[in-house]
């Protein structure tokens, strides 16, 4: 048993049918010695008396808010949560496996640049009685500071019969140098509590591996005289690290017809312009990627050919 | 400890082309190592990230773009002195800081070259003959060093009398390649920045 926060405790259970569970001793936080009784949640049934209460915690029915009273007055509370260990593996019931980039990916994180700011998000089908707490650091043995905000519900989607909820959090490394070569990964830890179930999820990454630039901005077309060709131009996104000559991007320019089946023409360039043939009803899209370290491509910025 | 935005002579940067080749070569070699050594811990998540140049060179700090010198977190106090003549510096106008930066890059390349050659000698003794260093990568390191053209004492190749542990050597190869790829990215950024300056 360990303390998650004041008066909230996590009981770790080896989770299998007929498991013996864990013996837990609760102590009433009071100078009083006599006439103390214990109850669980809203029930008025007295579970025991005395300054300490010994319970065998086996299932969720044994978890909850234990309260000690004296003469009708509440003295203190202890909330017991359960953390299930299933055959040596901590349970992951609360969050959905996003399966990207690999199985057992519960937290996904992205950064728009090298400033040390990043966003993480996760999915769940649970809509109520759910709380999250996020901590982060650079490295784990001698951790350096990363400050995270509060997790917020950022999107709701309908997936088949189920509603899916996306939560996200923004974090900022306290002293980040965009040019630094990372040798210690960023660690992100999310505590999740659903009703009386506690779970924790972690992700470890280098900022360089989670970079996903914003799409190029100011995408414009300039028709070339007496030609079906157009000059496409764009600019680096505002959120990208500067100077751009140091933090350079490479670009992919795509000409896509109205039908998805039509052949796509693609051009790769390090410049911020390209000359392409504009077909009728087609659209021109440009996306960006770090020129030197191949992390994710940005989303597409698009303009119609007409 | 930074690079001023100077305007060196046009076409002064043969090093840009070489640094691009270097990044391509090390990335290809790393990919090959990860495929060939699939049953070894060779991915970024699995290896320890070690920098063999740590406390010996200070490339990131010496080559910091001027725009980042206002960022306190980028200003590390490590000081290293380097010899300051080189053919990538095609103009006398080029600052002392730029010379310091390029000589730091040269020292990095020299250290990695020695490590890779020592490692290759060990890998050639492996009866499994599972993986060797790409000669192209070693050649590209050499070309960039020649383009930088700094006078520097030659570092003798390390030789070891004891029987090599091939498992450890292959894991060390992965660690070195990951670190060298990160340094090659920094070198490429620096060359691109200098080329635009």
């Amino acid at each position: 048993i360990w303390e998650l926060k004041k008066d909230v405790y996590v009981v770790e259970l080896d989770w299998y049918p007929d498991a013996p569970g864990e013996m837990v001793v609760l102590t009433c936080d009071t100078p009083e010695e006599d006439g103390i009784t214990w109850t669980l949640d809203q029930s008025s049934e007295v579970l025991g008396s005395g300054k300490t209460l010994t319970i065998q915690v086996k299932e969720f029915g044994d978890a909850g808010q234990y309260t000690c009273h004296k003469g009708g007055e509440v003295l203190s509370h202890s909330l017991l949560l359960l953390h299930k260990k299933e055959d040596g593996i901590w349970s992951t019931d609360i969050l959905k496996d996003q399966k990207e980039p690999k199985n057992k990916t519960f937290l996904r994180c992205e950064a728009k640049n090298y400033s040390g700011r990043f966003t993480c998000w996760w999915l769940t089908t649970i809509s109520t009685d759910l709380t999250f707490s996020v901590k982060s650091s650079r490295g784990s043995s001698d951790p350096q500071g990363v400050t995270c905000g509060a997790a917020t519900l950022s999107a709701e989607r309908v997936r088949g019969d189920n509603k899916e909820y996306e939560y996200s959090v923004e974090c900022q490394e306290d002293s980040a140098c965009p040019a630094a070569e990372e040798s210690l990964p960023i660690e992100v830890m999310v505590d999740a509590v659903h009703k009386l179930k506690y779970e924790n999820y972690t992700s470890s990454f280098f900022i360089r591996d989670i970079i996903k630039p914003d799409p190029p901005k100011n995408l414009q077309l300039k028709p070339l005289k007496n030609s079906r060709q157009v000059e496409v131009s764009w600019e680096y996104p505002d959120t990208w690290s500067t100077p751009h000559s140091y933090f350079s991007l490479t670009f992919c320019v795509q000409v896509q017809g109205k039908s998805k089946r039509e052949k796509k023409d693609r051009v790769f360039t390090d410049k911020t312009s390209a000359t392409v043939i504009c077909r009728k009803n087609a659209s021109i899209s440009v996306r960006a990627q770090d020129r030197y370290y191949s992390s994710s491509w940005s989303e597409w910025a698009s303009v119609p050919c007409s | 400890r930074n690079l001023p935005v100077a305007t060196p002579d046009p076409g002064m940067f043969p090093c840009l082309h070489h640094s691009q080749n270097l990044l391509r070569a090390v990335s290809n070699m790393l990919q090959k190592a990860r495929q060939t050594l699939e049953f070894y811990p060779c991915t970024s998540e699995e290896i320890d990230h070690e920098d063999i140049t740590k406390d010996k060179t200070s490339t990131v700090e010496a080559c910091l773009p001027l725009e980042l010198t206002k960022n306190e977190s980028c200003l590390n106090s490590r000081e290293t002195s380097f010899i300051t003549n080189g053919s990538c510096l095609a103009s006398r106008k080029t600052s002392f800081m730029m010379a310091l930066c390029l000589s730091s890059i040269y020292e990095d390349l020299k250290m990695y070259q020695v490590e890779f050659k020592t490692m290759n000698a060990k890998l050639l003794m492996d009866p499994k003959r599972q993986i060797f260093l790409d000669q192209n990568m070693l050649a590209v390191i050499d070309e960039l060093m020649q383009a930088l053209n700094f006078n520097s004492e030659t570092v003798p190749q390390k030789s070891s009398l004891e029987e090599p542990d091939f498992y450890k050597t292959k894991i060390k190869l992965c660690i070195l390649l990951h670190a060298f790829r990160i340094r090659a990215v920094t070198i490429d950024r620096v060359m691109s920045y200098l080329n635009a300056s």
């Epitope: 080896d14 989770w15 299998y16 007929d18 498991a19 040596g88 019931d93 057992k104 089908t125 | -």
Partner: antibody, heavy 115, light 111 residues
Framework: QVQLVQSGGGVVQPGRSLRLSCAAS????????MHWVRQAPGKGLEWVAF????????YYADSVKGRFTISRDNSKNTLYLQMKSLRAEDTAVYYC????????WGQGTMVTVSS | SYVLTQPPSVSGTPGQRVTISCSGG????????VKWYQQLPGTAPKLLIY???QRPSGVPDRFSGSKSGTSASLAITGVQAEDEADYYC????????????FGTGTKVTVL
């Protein structure tokens, strides 16, 4: 006392279907994940499928993916394995087992796929 | 479909120490716990060891398990006639939740 009682085995022709059941008692069935494991005659144990405690996620061995479906009815304390497009190589004793460090096994039920 | 490799058979005389090896990889034994089962002819497997080296109550202390890296082993110190059976190691595949991987099985013969 944890008990898993299996039924539904038998002889079936290739290409046909069969449904196995596993009735659980002596524990809170709805709180635990469940597996199906099989053993071909004279061969070793092979994992077939797994279902989470609430039925939200199901996982299958490549050899049965797309043909077998694991399901559960927590109100009836019963685990199922629906087997379609059966092949001769599916001939085996099928066991249901609880998920956990200490697992409980059913008595096994024989499925024979033969023409 | 057997990811974990065991010797097909091992034998020993009563009182001898018998060990069975179980070899896997980084995605199974390397990152998950190992179990051992004993299976007597015509019966369901019985759990002998869980969590690499833990014995459930009721299992004699002559059975012990260990794990190192991507391999595990089961030792029977002072093997007895009733220990003649098939033994299987089991772990999980890290890439797929709940995916149990079993060893090829070892027949223990008491001479």
């Amino acid at each position: 006392q944890v008990q898993l009682v299996q039924s539904g085995g038998g002889v079936v022709q290739p290409g046909r279907s069969l449904r196995l059941s596993c009735a659980a008692s002596g524990f809170t069935f709805s709180s635990y994940g469940m597996h199906w494991v099989r053993q071909a005659p004279g061969k070793g144990l092979e994992w077939v499928a797994f279902i989470r405690y609430d039925g939200s996620n199901k996982y299958y061995a490549d050899s049965v993916k797309g043909r077998f479906t694991i399901s559960r009815d927590n109100s009836k304390n019963t685990l199922y394995l629906q087997m379609k497009s059966l092949r001769a190589e599916d001939t085996a004793v099928y066991y249901c087992t609880t998920h956990g460090s200490h697992d409980n096994w059913g008595q096994g039920t024989m499925v024979t796929v033969s023409s | 479909s057997y990811v974990l490799t065991q010797p097909p058979s091992v034998s020993g005389t009563p009182g001898q120490r018998v060990t069975i090896s179980c070899s896997g990889g980084r995605s199974n034994i390397g990152s998950n716990t190992v179990k051992w089962y004993q299976q007597l002819p015509g019966t369901a497997p019985k759990l002998l060891i869980y969590g690499n080296d833990q014995r459930p109550s009721g299992v004699p202390d002559r059975f012990s398990g260990s794990k190192s890296g991507t391999s595990a082993s089961l030792a029977i110190t002072g093997v007895q006639a009733e220990d003649e059976a098939d033994y299987y190691c089991q772990s999980y595949d890290s890439s797929l939740w709940g995916s149990r991987v079993f060893g090829t099985g070892t027949k223990v013969t008491v001479l």
